[in-house]
């Protein structure tokens, strides 16, 4: 059976993303998210 370890050599990159709230609605200010492995999670 294959054994999967957290430190098996795969590196997960994360990056902060900033969007303007008014691009998606009427609010002002910035929306800050986090992209992990190509997926925005927050």
């Amino acid at each position: 059976d294959a054994e999967f370890r957290h430190d098996s050599g795969y590196e997960v990159h994360h990056q902060k993303l900033v969007f303007f709230a008014e691009d998606v609605g009427s609010n002002k200010g910035a929306i800050i998210g986090l992209m992990v492995g190509g997926v925005v999670i927050a």
Partner: nanobody, 124 residues
Framework: EVQLVESGGGLVQAGGSLRLSCVAS????????MGWFRQAPGKEREFVAA????????YYTDSVKGRFTISRDSSKNTVYLQMNSLKPEDTADYYC?????????????????WGQGTQVTVSS
Amino acid sequence: EVQLVESGGGLVQAGGSLRLSCVASGLTFSSYNMGWFRQAPGKEREFVAAISRSGGSTYYTDSVKGRFTISRDSSKNTVYLQMNSLKPEDTADYYCAAALFGSAINLLSEYRYWGQGTQVTVSS
């Protein structure tokens, strides 16, 4: 043809001020969030500040908060970067860029159009 033309750079002593301007042509100005980036010698280009399409929202990198102010004048298709309390570490080429609304404003790759840059040198 889309053009972004920066001006206002120069040599200034530490503690001084400069105002950069960027005139946009060939695009629908109201459809684009506008940003300023900078690139110091030997370093990667980095985000400085951005302003929303309406001008109602702004965002700054931590190192310039309270010192730099971004603004825009839609009647002149121009975006400005007022830089106060300049430091030697602000020395760089400064670039104006345009990103379609909905883009992540702090990522270089999200910006569709770029100017040629204007040089800012802060001496100690």
